[in-house]
């Protein structure tokens, strides 16, 4: 899963895979995230060490177990790669470092009036990776206002020195802010000349291009296809650069494909991951694990969840299959690319999606695998439909959960709006796991319309359902996508794999939790539920869930959130957390609004004037 915590005054011992100089721990963490083997890092700020050679040292580390022993080191900062952290994965680094000179090859000097202008020049220069700017108060007059554009073999400074009146930073090309623009064309049967900066094996030219885009020194590439005449060069992706930034020559060549890095694209960069699956192809590499799974997509998910896994092969050989499950070979290599690519096999291969920061645009989530009393922490992307409904009055606080059911629709409980019907005070946070990650800069959705069921009455348990129309539609990502809704006439009388999620209290007289909690709760029949609540009417439009002995339940703050069940292989929104007697009490199940009973109402309210459904259900 995604681990974001930093460890102050701690240094991971051993496991080194690379080292470099970086201006701070955050940049070090980013380099770790994009390094194919790095899981952990340790950074030594200038203040933490007397050894001048190790100041600003960034040490990238790997570990078979995913952890390393921590030793105390004053001033050191350590942490985890952000692989698997979705939207936190970015190569963009905007910070300016004052009093620091980042050394490298100075290839361009010009006079500018500000450090921002210097950064802009770097961003608009195809070869510039980082820069230094001498301010107007620099001690040598002839260097004042100098903007030095720089590069280095690894894309990071060759040294970092403390120097007064100098400011340094990185190109914003990885932020998709370059004015250069990019060449999207792929040139068939054409080979580029110039300097090779790296050589990797890839299944196609598009993977080659993405690797080039995120390689610090690749400006263009040539890919040799799997029918290239020289067998040892098949599937070779040559990453290239030149002094001018463009190929000095190109040669017509059968079965080669060439193209350019997309790092200079404006507004959008390709994701730093490869989602395509390659049928009939085997990827060779170091064996990490072999597991039996059902289908190539599950194999890819398994690889993605296993943080060290870089790529996989799913074998369909009869000897590798039993029943409907076949062997999923999870693999890795030094550079993150296969060491061998074989065609015409009975396998399908692909890459881990651990560096993906967005998911597909599928209409409802089928592939995922309260505070809640008796629950456990959820992980990133586990419940991507879960939203937090927060109220901002004098302070801001989480009040209820909700479920994303479409680009512009959230389903929740009507009672969440008791006494707070004003849409302007609500903020809806989606795609989050930790409430503590919410800052004033965290994007949120505002409410365009609150639609409370017409038969709901305050302080009654019936028809506890409400729809929220968001002011603007949300994009779907791995961490923010909708839950499938049931059909009106759901055939399943009792679901057998149901979960409740939320940030609510962990005990009756508790407090809102930071990390989204999950709990597996069995449904109970309405007849059984009615026996436990003799003072209330349990209607057919309600569904109950809970353990006879109690101990696991939804609680205050979970209201409006989802009760989801896996039904015939797909997750469905079965209930909306509504009410119960206390929390997790013995023989007092939680009561949920039964979504299937309100499907006509949901569709009626979410359909626009042209009769097309604006809400997304499984499609």
């Amino acid at each position: 899963g995604c681990l974001t915590q930093l460890y102050e005054n701690a240094f991971f011992r051993g496991g080194d895979v690379a080292s470099m100089y970086t201006p701070n721990a955050q940049y070090c963490q980013m380099r770790c995230t994009f390094h194919p083997r790095c899981l952990l890092f340790s950074f030594l700020p200038a203040s933490s060490i007397n050894d001048m050679e190790k100041r600003f040292g960034c040490f990238l580390k790997d570990s078979v177990t995913g952890t390393l022993p921590k030793v105390h080191r004053t001033g050191a900062v350590s942490g985890h790669s952000l692989k698997q952290c979705g939207h936190q994965i970015s190569a963009c680094h905007r910070d300016i470092y004052k009093g620091v000179d980042m050394r490298g090859v100075n290839f361009n000097v010009s006079k500018v009036s500000s450090v921002e202008e210097c950064q802009k020049r770097c961003t608009s220069n195809i070869r510039c990776q980082f820069f230094s700017y001498a301010t107007q108060t620099f001690h040598k007059a002839e260097y004042r206002n100098n903007c030095l554009l720089k590069y280095s073999p690894g894309g990071t400074p060759t040294a970092i020195k403390v120097l007064s009146n100098v400011e340094s930073g990185f190109s914003l090309k990885p932020c998709a802010l370059s004015e250069i623009g990019c060449h999207m064309n792929i040139f068939q049967h054409l080979a580029f000349s110039d300097v090779d900066v790296a050589r990797v094996l890839t299944p196609d030219a598009f993977v080659c291009r993405t690797i080039c885009t995120y390689h610090p020194n690749c400006l263009f590439f040539t890919f040799y296809t799997n029918v290239w005449k020289i067998e040892s060069q098949r599937n070779v992706c040559l990453l290239k650069t030149s002094e001018s930034g463009t190929p000095s020559s190109s040669t017509p060549q059968e079965n080669t494909i060439s193209g350019y890095s997309l790092l200079t694209c404006k507004r959008t960069l390709p994701e730093p991951c490869h989602s395509k699956i390659y049928p009939g192809v085997d990827f060779g590499g170091e064996e990490l694990n072999v597991t039996f799974v059902k289908g190539v997509n599950v194999c890819q998910e398994t690889c993605t969840k296993m943080i060290r896994c870089q790529f996989f092969t799913y074998s369909l050989l009869p000897e590798d299959c039993k029943e409907e499950k076949c062997k999923c070979f999870l693999r890795l290599s030094m550079d993150g690319s296969p060491t061998r690519i074989a065609y015409g096999t009975q396998g399908s291969s692909g890459y881990s999606l651990r560096l993906c920061n967005t998911g597909d645009n599928s209409v409802c989530t089928t592939k995922t695998s309260t505070r809640i009393v008796g629950g456990t922490n959820s992980s990133w992307g586990e419940w991507p439909w879960q939203v937090s409904l927060q109220v901002k009055l004098t302070a801001q606080r989480h009040l209820c959960g909700g479920s994303l059911i479409g680009h512009q629709w959230v389903l929740t409980a009507a009672h969440c709006f008791d006494g707070l019907p004003l849409q302007d005070v609500w903020r809806i946070y989606s795609g989050i796991l930790n409430l503590s990650d919410i800052t004033k800069d965290t994007p949120f959705s505002q409410i365009k319309e609150i639609i409370i069921h017409q038969n709901y009455k305050v302080s009654e348990g019936n028809h506890d359902i409400a729809l929220i129309k968001l002011q603007a539609p949300l994009n779907y990502t791995e961490f923010q996508k909708p839950i499938c809704l049931p059909s009106k006439g759901d055939t399943s009388t009792i679901y057998t794999n149901c979960w409740v999620t939320g940030w609510g209290f962990s005990k009756e007289k508790g407090e809102i939790q930071n990390i989204l909690q999950k709990v597996n709760i069995p449904l109970v029949t309405n007849e059984e539920c009615q026996k436990r609540y003799q003072d209330y009417k349990i209607t057919q439009r309600m569904v109950c869930a809970g353990y006879k002995e109690g101990g696991k339940d939804a609680c205050k703050g979970d209201s409006g959130g989802p009760l989801v069940c896996k039904h015939n292989g797909m997750w469905r929104l079965v209930g909306i957390t509504s009410w119960g007697e206390g929390c997790a009490r013995r023989e007092q199940p939680g009561v949920y609004t039964k979504v299937a009973e309100y499907m006509d109402w949901i569709l009626e309210k979410t359909q626009s004037s042209d009769g097309k459904a604006q809400m997304q259900s499984p499609a």
Epitope: G489, D490, I494, T496, N568, P618
Partner: antibody
Framework: QVQLVQSGAEVKKPGASVKVSCKAS????????MHWVRQPPGKGLEWIGA????????AYNQKFKGRVTITADESTSTAYMELSSLTSEDTAVYYC??????????WGQGTLVTVSS | DIQMTQSPSSLSASVGDRVTITCKAS??????LAWYQQKPGQAPRLLMS???GLEAGVPSRFSGSGSGTDFTLTISSLQPEDFATYYC?????????FGQGTKVEIK
């Protein structure tokens, strides 16, 4: 891979009962519903009902007015459909079908039930 | 019960033709519709649905559209193996119901 293997053809007299079996393999039997659909000769498809083996829950098409009983045996991963008070109108190929989501992604090979005096 | 009406009940077409089959529901079924192909002596085969789109292994010449009460199955360029009977099925409300079928024959 998922396989549904049905019992052989049956010939029944009017008023009798028939019990058709469907043995499932290649997946976890208790995780998915099993549905039954029939098709009279040269005609269209008609949904009979379903069972969720994991919970024992059933759902029936009211058209069959209590004549149908669907059961499942977890130990053998087999579902059964029993239809009583047979008439010539019940002559049909009976299919078991396993859904993915709601639609029927996997089908048995079919069992022909002939009702004739 | 929701009635599903398919049209035409049969059609004759040649290889390479574009074929369109329509299915009309007696009430709004949103997008909860599946299409099946059945060849003589065989069980039906799921082609596509509102749940999961085009099934794995189904050629891209098959496509579906519609929402609410009116739905369409299109075969963009009919191939010899496509001559069969096609059924629509709603899974919005039990009992699940099927259209009466459309037989696609060789002209």
């Amino acid at each position: 891979q998922v396989q549904l293997v049905q019992s052989g053809a049956e010939v029944k007299k009017p008023g009798a009962s028939v019990k058709v079996s469907c043995k499932a393999s290649g997946y976890t039997f208790t995780d998915y519903e099993m549905h039954w659909v029939r098709q009279p000769p040269g005609k269209g498809l008609e949904w009979i009902g379903a069972i969720h083996p994991g919970s024992g829950g059933t759902a029936y098409n009211q058209k069959f007015k209590g004549r149908v009983t669907i059961t499942a045996d977890e130990s053998t991963s087999t579902a059964y459909m029993e239809l009583s008070s047979l008439t010539s109108e019940d002559t049909a190929v009976y299919y078991c079908a396993r859904p993915y989501g709601y639609p029927f992604a996997y089908w048995g090979q079919g069992t022909l039930v002939t009702v004739s005096s | 019960d929701i009635q599903m009406t398919q049209s035409p009940s049969s059609l004759s077409a040649s290889v390479g033709d574009r074929v369109t089959i329509t299915c009309k529901a007696s009430e709004d079924i949103y997008n909860r519709l599946a299409w099946y192909q059945q060849k003589p002596g065989q069980a039906p085969r799921l082609l596509m649905s509102g749940e999961t789109g085009l099934e794995a292994g189904v050629p891209s010449r098959f496509s579906g559209s519609g929402s609410g009460t009116d739905f369409t199955l299109t075969i963009s360029s009919l191939q010899p193996e496509d001559f069969a009977t096609y059924y629509c099925q709603q899974y919005w409300s039990t009992p699940w119901t099927f259209g009466q079928g459309t037989k696609v024959e060789i002209k």
